[in-house]
Interface confidence: medium
């Protein structure tokens, strides 16, 4: 079964900046990957970026860039507005539409013992479904 | 029926500083982007921001970010926009608007907030 | 940032007539903008997202067409209500922006 996996980490040299990675395992080639913060897509949570590999991306601030890592892996650099740091408690959901295997989902958030540079394990779990 | 209330008009002193309120209803307030929106008299709208209330997530204008600060309070459903150090440009009617998290349409505006700075 | 270019600035038009307005924008926006209606006083009122889409309660003689870097929202047989000004907005990425906007007026 396919899987998706997310991993956020603080940034070491800045600690208003973060970073969302996430990464699809399994067969089939990805037409669409999207990254939303507060919940899943379409439940709640908001975009923070869509990267598509052949029309590029798009994002939205707070994201300042997000870039694909490998064909099936990708990055979001976020740089946190104000002082009350929400993407410290905040849970972000990468969602990797494939074919043919449809869509998969997954989410996590910095955990809330993380030191500055570490990174929450890789949480491989789809949470939502194969649409 | 979704609306947004804004406070009423502001008269302020050039330096001072000043908070619009827009109080959301008929939806669940937490699920939306807000947005702020300055129009000058006469003149064409500039994005100022938004807000995420979910998590009080922000994003700026580069041009309003040492300018504008957006909170909200959740209890009470109501966002904030306070202005600071204002000078006799910033005299505008300031609109919140409310987005879907599709980041498609702002499909809900407020009446508007016309603040003026004049000494 | 993307940068919105909005035309005409102004248009005189009479009750039945049909008219266009143009937005251009620097760089390729797919299909992420909306029209916005105001009227003196009022604020904008959402007429068309995602380029074509109709927001509800809008009368269909609005239309809006294009992708890329060139858009166009048409009124077809203008009514007395439709005079007022039009904006444009990317929403393809932050920062938003707004076209000059176009200001249609009676003849």
């Known amino acids: 079964t396919p899987e998706v996996w997310v991993q956020v980490q603080m940034e070491a040299t800045e600690l208003s900046s973060f970073t969302v990675h996430c990464g699809f395992l399994g067969p089939g080639s990805i037409s669409l990957v999207t990254v939303s913060w507060g919940g899943p897509d379409g439940a709640g949570g908001t975009k923070l970026a869509v990267l598509h590999p052949e029309l590029g991306t798009r994002q939205w601030a707070p994201a300042r860039q997000a870039r694909w890592e490998t064909q099936s892996s990708i990055s979001l650099a976020l740089e946190d507005s104000g002082a009350s740091s929400p993407f410290a408690n905040t849970t972000f959901c990468c969602k990797f539409a494939s074919f043919p295997e449809g869509s998969w989902e997954s989410c996590g958030s910095l955990p809330p013992s993380s030191d500055p540079g570490l990174s929450a394990p890789p949480t491989p779990v789809p949470i939502l479904r194969a649409d | 029926e979704v609306q947004l209330q804004q406070s009423g008009p502001e008269l302020v002193k050039p330096g001072a500083s000043v908070r619009i309120s827009c109080k959301a209803s008929g939806y669940t307030f937490t699920d939306y982007n807000m947005h702020w929106v300055k129009q000058s008299h006469g003149k064409s709208l500039e994005w100022i921001g938004y807000?995420?209330?979910?998590?009080?997530?922000?994003g700026h204008n580069q041009n309003f970010k040492s300018k504008a600060t957006l909170t909200v309070d959740k209890s009470s459903s109501t966002a904030y926009m306070e202005f600071r150090s204002l000078t006799s440009d910033d005299s505008a009617v300031y609109y919140c608007a409310r987005e879907d998290f599709r980041h498609e349409k702002m499909d809900y505006w407020g009446q508007g907030t016309s603040v003026t700075v004049s000494s | 940032d993307i940068q919105m270019t909005q035309s005409p600035a102004s248009l005189s038009a009479s009750v039945g007539e049909t008219v266009t307005i143009t937005c251009r924008t620097s760089?390729?926006?797919?299909?992420?903008l909306s029209w916005y209606q105001q009227k003196q006083g009022k604020s904008p009122q959402l007429l068309v997202y995602n380029a074509k889409t109709l927001t509800e309660n809008v009368p269909s003689r609005f239309s809006g067409s294009g992708s890329g870097t060139q858009f166009s929202l048409k009124i077809n047989s203008l009514q007395p209500e439709d005079f007022g000004s039009y904006y444009c907005?990317?929403?393809?990425?932050?920062?938003?922006?707004f076209g000059g906007g176009t200001k249609l007026e009676i003849k």
């Open positions: 907005q990317h929403h393809y990425g932050t920062p938003y922006t």
């Open positions: 807000i995420y209330p979910y998590n009080g997530g922000t």
């Open positions: 760089d390729n926006i797919y299909v992420y």
